[in-house]
């Protein structure tokens, strides 16, 4: 008799998920000497324990605590780059500016980046067919709770000047419902963080508007100011030139506005 299986609205677990997590863990610990002590098989054990055999709409931050403990990592708290809806450019930037870190430059973020996973209640199986969608099914699903947990911890660790890269091409440049807007903004610690500096990335080549005046940016400024953190904003009119100038700051064309 075929076993009834819950059909969710979202895509299923990424194929070869355990192998991918293990392989990423091994690669990361080889590249980052400060994480060489990490036993990747134990990391996977903690990861599987967070969601396997559990109802994929009943996951809690507590479920991820063993994994958080094993993945504890110290990054320079004044070198943190947050991002919203512009992941690729943020990652390109930290690949060049090696002393700055996005969440995906940490072990736990690197392990899970672009992956989907979920289990089934009361079975030790991974569900490769479908997983809950945040909007259509439930918000307390394994992927969403993971990112909420690691994002909160990442924001809590930040200090001094924190940078955030925002997508100026979107209708809501700052979106209160994004991970940045709903988690990270509210977990920056005012006693440690002096300033949040937003970099608004322009999409069009001819776009010379000051997107720092956008209503959603003003809304972000208001939220941040109420939390006793200073706010500043810069337009990045030419993201391609911006990256080029990060690579070669001595270039003569890099003195003008980018």
């Amino acid at each position: 008799v075929p076993r009834w299986r819950q059909q969710w609205s979202g895509p299923g677990t990424t194929k070869r998920f355990p192998e991918t997590v293990l392989a990423r863990c091994v690669k990361y610990t080889e590249i980052h000497p400060e994480m060489r002590h990490v036993d990747c098989q134990s990391v996977w054990d903690a990861f599987k324990g967070a969601f396997i055999s559990k109802h994929p709409c009943n996951i809690t931050e507590e479920d991820y605590q063993p994994l958080m403990k094993l993945g504890t990592q110290t990054v320079p708290c004044n070198k943190i780059l947050l991002w919203s809806r512009i992941k690729d450019l943020a990652h390109q930037f930290t690949q060049v500016q090696r002393d700055m870190f996005t969440l995906e430059d940490t072990l736990l973020g690197y392990l899970a980046d672009d992956l989907t996973w979920c289990g089934e209640f009361n079975t030790s199986k991974i569900n490769y067919q479908s997983c809950p969608d945040w909007r259509k099914d439930c918000s307390n699903n394994p992927v969403s709770v993971f990112w909420k947990t690691v994002s909160r911890r990442f924001a809590e660790a930040a200090c001094d000047v924190v940078h955030v890269m925002l997508n100026g091409s979107r209708s809501k440049i700052f979106d209160k419902n994004s991970t940045f807007g709903s988690v990270e903004v509210h977990n920056l610690q005012p006693e440690k963080v002096q300033t949040l500096e937003a970099w608004v990335i322009h999409g069009g080549r001819e776009d010379s508007r000051d997107l720092c005046q956008d209503p959603t940016i003003k809304e972000l400024e208001s939220i941040i100011s109420k939390r006793n953190i200073q706010f500043s904003c810069k337009n990045i009119y030419r993201p391609d030139k911006f990256l080029q100038c990060v690579k070669n700051p001595e270039d003569s064309s890099c003195t003008s506005e980018i």
Epitope: L22, C40, Q41, K48, G49, S53, T123, K125
Partner: antibody, heavy 120, light 107 residues
Framework: QVQLVQSGAEVKKPGSSVKVSCKAS????????FSWVRQAPGQGLEWMGR????????NSAQKFQGRVTITADKSTSTAYMELSSLRSEDTAVYYC?????????????WGQGTLVTVSS | DIQMTQSPSSLSASVGDRVTITCRAS??????LAWYQQKPEKAPKSLIY???SLQSGVPSRFSGSGSGTDFTLTISSLQPEDFATYYC?????????FGQGTKVEIK
């Protein structure tokens, strides 16, 4: 069907090393992990460590760290366990056992065991 | 390390008896528990995984239950071929650890 065939019995002197092999057939070697479990005469089972051939990485119980080396050769579908600085209390039957990489299940297949006797 | 404690360490029973073996973990292991049967001079054989799932080819008289720290292996009607030593094992975390074993002998 799946078979794990281990190397033959060994008699070793204290202070020396032993290397036991476990050849897998009937399954995709790189899709699994291989653990080594030992059993001293009249005693229970003791897990020593585990290797994931597709990654080439192993871990081991703290008790054996520095003394055990667990490796795998994908080209011959063989897992190895080398134990150094042997002492009399290492006299035991050594088993290799297979589980899935994701460790979602038990050791579903076991080798026949290799008796290692440490004696002067 | 997680300690696994089995009880009893040995028991005598007759063919047809219902036999229960318990296993307790020193900390919660969810359902990451396996049961093995071992006969003299033989390798262990997997019976139960995930605390209650029957390994393929294992007779249905074997069943497992429990989660967290307390687990049970039950043989509903003991058969002559069931006289052996039984081990529980956790695979929640490293190092993997086994119970000390329960020897089931003929009364």
């Amino acid at each position: 069907q799946v078979q794990l065939v281990q190397s033959g019995a060994e008699v070793k002197k204290p202070g020396s090393s032993v290397k036991v092999s476990c050849k897998a057939s009937g399954g995709t070697f790189s899709s699994y992990a291989f653990s080594w479990v030992r059993q001293a005469p009249g005693q229970g089972l003791e897990w020593m460590g585990r290797v994931i051939p597709f990654l080439g990485t192993a871990n081991s119980a703290q008790k054996f760290q520095g003394r055990v080396t667990i490796t795998a050769d994908k080209s011959t579908s063989t897992a190895y366990m080398e134990l150094s600085s042997l002492r009399s209390e290492d006299t035991a039957v050594y088993y290799c056992a297979r589980d899935d990489i994701a460790a979602l299940g038990p050791f579903d297949y076991w080798g026949q065991g290799t008796l290692v006797t440490v004696s002067s | 390390d997680i300690q696994m404690t089995q009880s009893p360490s040995s028991l005598s029973a007759s063919v047809g008896d219902r036999v229960t073996i318990t296993c307790r973990a020193s900390q919660g292991i969810s359902s990451w528990l396996a049961w093995y049967q071992q006969k003299p001079e033989k390798a262990p054989k997997s019976l139960i995984y995930a605390a209650s799932s029957l390994q393929s080819g294992v007779p249905s008289r074997f069943s497992g239950s429990g989660s967290g720290t307390d687990f049970t292996l039950t043989i509903s009607s003991l058969q002559p071929e069931d006289f052996a030593t039984y081990y529980c094992q956790q695979y929640n975390s490293y190092p993997r650890t086994f119970g000390q074993g329960t020897k089931v002998e003929i009364k």
